[in-house]
């Protein structure tokens, strides 16, 4: 009987491992789809730019390396911020490194005072994990500093030089990001 129980336990363990693997594959697939979309968008923009020798970023957007950033002048709740960015062929800001964070916070200091700006970071309701819009997790140094006490969905925002969290239904400015166009040669 003990042997039977231990066999069942091992089978369940194996099933669990397979499910975890499947979930990991799905997360990777989701992320790769999001990245492919970004690359497609960049490719389309670059193709268009070769027709008109335009600047790497649209008017009122800031360039840093291969990215263009738009610092909004309107308030929005998090979901509408994302929609606003999508309408401009961009997404809410995804901060990949400390260097990018420093550039953003430095730019904000020059543009405006110490306001709140939504970025593309939200907390998964079930696991409580922080995720960027493409399904990837932020690097440990780029996790929101404080956990919001809100029972509602929680999203990430930048203020001064910190990444913080708040109820997604609050009104804030926001930052969009898209690929800079490669200048046609």
């Amino acid at each position: 009987k003990l042997l039977q129980v231990s066999t069942i336990a091992m089978q369940q363990q194996e099933k669990l491992i397979q499910q975890e693997r499947a979930l990991l594959n799905f997360t990777e697939w989701k992320r790769s789809c999001a990245l492919q979309m970004k690359y497609c968008q960049a490719f389309m923009q670059n193709s268009l730019s070769s027709a008109h020798n335009s600047s790497p970023c649209p008017n009122n957007w800031i360039q840093n390396r291969e990215s263009c950033y738009y610092v909004s002048e309107i308030w929005s709740i998090w979901h509408t911020s994302q929609e606003n960015c999508l309408k401009e062929g961009s997404t809410l800001l995804q901060i990949e490194s400390k260097e990018e964070m420093d550039f953003i916070t430095g730019s904000l200091r020059k543009i405006k005072g110490s306001y709140d700006y939504w970025v593309g970071l939200s907390q998964d309701g079930h696991s409580g994990r922080w995720l960027w819009q493409d399904g990837s997790s932020p690097s440990p140094g780029l996790l929101p500093a404080e956990r919001s006490q809100s029972a509602n969905q929680v999203c990430g925002y930048v203020k001064s030089n910190s990444l913080l969290s708040s109820n997604c239904s609050t009104w804030k400015y926001f930052i969009c990001e898209k690929y800079a166009l490669r200048s046609s040669v």
């Epitope: 738009y70 929005s76 509408t80 606003n84 309408k87 401009e88 239904s169 009104w171 969009c176």
Partner: nanobody, 116 residues
């Protein structure tokens, strides 16, 4: 082309109230978050208040909080700004527009003058 029309402005005494109204020709406002801005002579245009498309959430600039109320009537295709306890510093031209990165062409605005 969409045309925004603001109305309801006027000359009032400090402490009085006014109700501004905004409507759009050729466009249904119900799908859009809408906002009011104002511009005083020689100053930049500043954000006053915003309301979601459904009307269930609003937000205000600190300088009007508790005095101004933004609302909408989607059936009548209008967005309103109720202005109470007006101050001389509220003197400006008031404009409404869609709350989006790309805004519609600005209307003529409606002039509000508050005398002390």
């Amino acid at each position: 082309q969409v045309q925004l029309v603001e109305s309801g402005g006027g000359l009032v005494q400090a402490g009085d109230s006014l109700r501004l109204s905004c409507t759009a020709s050729e466009r249904n406002l119900r799908s859009y978050d809408m906002a009011w801005w104002r511009q005083a002579p020689g100053k930049e245009r500043e954000y006053v208040a915003v309301i979601t498309s459904s009307g269930d959430s609003t937000h205000y600039s600190d300088f009007v909080k508790g005095r101004f109320t933004i609302s909408r009537d989607n059936a009548k295709n209008t967005v309103s700004l109720q202005m109470d306890s007006l101050k001389p510093e509220d003197t400006a031209s008031y404009y409404c527009n869609v709350n989006a990165i790309r805004q519609w062409p600005w209307g003529q605005g409606t002039q509000v003058t508050v005398s002390s």
